[in-house]
């Protein structure tokens, strides 16, 4: 409680805010928790406290640890903890998960990527932006204040974006980088009550005894990326896996298709070596999402082999 994780790279500036807030007039004291040693406020120190901020200029791996801040309000001394981890710089391009800030989503209409934590620093424009370690170039990319704007966002724009800027402290410059993932979502997307395209309600499917048969359950759920949408088969109201007939299996994985821009899913039910008793079962195609569940029932009937003598 009242604890915050902060991280940075060695030889870069890192500024951490006390997880306990307070009015600007309140005194804030910082301590290194392991030793209870007070953090100096003099700016000549590499690590120093400045009110609600703890500054590492620059940070070193050995600075990692838990720092305690005490905000002295008129009534109580309120305590917070900053868990600081400083990592060695990676030699390769990949940014590990532990250095990533929260993922942001964008769309054609809204494609702002904010540079994480930048408000804590004394920086001047412009920001430098990189995607998957490549400097961003071209008229589609615009660095504006503390965020990046991407024009005409496409799905290929998804990836890891790094902002790089310079923090200035009393005339000295320190580099800072921060990375976050960007995902692209279809803003025009919408979600509907499931619409089952196949099979038709109460459809009778003709099958040949001894042969294999396939039944396809296909449903659409709206436009764009859908959450919690699924299609599945049931036998006599029971899940296929629970029914216990190895000859009857659902195709592993659901195929996603976009029909006229609609998001659709289908699931194939495979019946091997059709038997007489299979004709007595009720086959239910179920489509469900956040709006609800729709069910279409299918029954099998015997298809007579063609009599070549008649």
């Amino acid at each position: 409680k009242f604890s915050k994780q902060s991280w940075g790279l060695e030889n870069e500036a890192l500024i951490v805010r006390c997880p306990r807030q307070g009015k600007p007039s309140y005194t804030v004291d910082w301590y290194y928790s392991q030793t209870n040693k007070s953090i100096p406020t003099q700016e000549r120190n590499r690590v120093f406290a400045s009110g609600q901020l703890l500054k590492f200029l620059p940070a070193a791996v050995a600075d990692s640890g838990i720092y305690t801040c005490i905000v002295r309000s008129p009534t109580f001394n309120r305590t917070g903890y900053a868990n600081v981890t400083i990592y060695k710089k990676q030699s390769d391009c990949n940014v590990p998960d532990y250095l990533m800030y929260s993922t942001v989503s964008g769309s054609e209409k809204n494609s702002k990527i904010y540079c994480p934590t930048i408000d804590l620093y004394n920086w001047t424009a412009p920001l430098e932006w990189f995607k998957n370690c490549q400097a961003l170039q071209g008229s589609r990319y615009r660095a504006h204040k503390s965020f990046l704007v991407i024009d005409n966002v496409m799905t290929e724009d998804a990836g890891d974006y790094t902002c790089k800027f310079i923090h200035n402290e009393n005339g000295a410059n320190y580099s800072v980088t921060a990375t976050r993932s960007f995902t692209v979502k279809d803003e025009q997307g919408f979600s509907l009550f499931p619409v089952i395209g196949a099979p038709a309600q109460n459809e009778i499917k003709e099958v040949e005894i001894g042969k294999n048969a396939n039944l396809t359950c296909s449903a659409c759920f709206g436009k764009g990326t859908q959450f919690l949408a699924a299609v599945l088969w049931q036998l006599n109201g029971t899940k296929i896996t629970d029914f216990g007939e190895p000859r009857i299996q659902q195709e592993e994985g659901q195929n996603q298709s976009f029909s006229n821009g609609l998001a659709c899913l289908d699931m194939v039910l495979r019946i091997a070596d059709v038997k007489e008793e299979d004709l007595l079962l009720q086959y239910d195609c179920l489509a469900l999402n956040l709006h609800g569940l729709r069910r279409h029932t299918v029954r099998l009937s015997r298809k007579n082999p063609i009599d070549h003598h008649s």
């Epitope: 409680k1 306990r20 807030q21 307070g22 009015k23 007039s25 905000v71 309000s73 008129p74 009534t75 109580f76 309120r78």
Partner: antibody
Amino acid sequence: QVQLVQSGAEVKKPGASVKVSCKASGYTFTDYELHWVRQAPGQGLEWMGTIDPETGDTVYNQKFKARVTMTADKSTSTAYMELSSLRSEDTAVYYCTRAFYNDYDDAFAYWGQGTLVTVSS
Amino acid sequence: EIVMTQSPATLSLSPGERATLSCSVSSSVSYMHWYQQKPGQAPRRLIYDTSKLASGIPARFSGSGSGTDYTLTISSLEPEDAAVYYCQQWNSSPLTFGGGTKVEIK
């Protein structure tokens, strides 16, 4: 929504003690300090003190320090204010109250309905 | 402790008039809070941090001041503004309130 519900009115004799309760709901009880303010009939507001429900730490107004005890029960999200050695001038409405955002002490945004304590022989 | 003095004790004005309530402090404070209290009700936060309007409070209420002198202004009085108004400091313990200004609507 944030609610502070106080116990009912009390009539006490001089020298007795009174314990007023304040049940909090609609927020995490231990995240906010609770204060007690009283108001004598036709008079102004007077701050009695505050408790941090997380730690049980208290800060009292020096005027009441010898007679007041503030406690908090985390399991029921209830704060208590006990005032002992009651005298007639303790007749007042007692309020529990909470700031809007704890760390910024940005005024008492939420108030209980008040508990009238009457001290009479 | 910090002593808060409110003036005037009573203010009697007509609807539509401007009301100016003062709060004088015995030693300098950084912020001032203001409350409105109607008979039989708990106080209601009006202005916090000197000039910030609390949610749900009409824009005719405003606060200003610094150091030892603070003001609550009601730009155009409405009948429902009849109440007692209190200032409060949170600069040092004990927290203290002013004695209140009663606003009456003629």
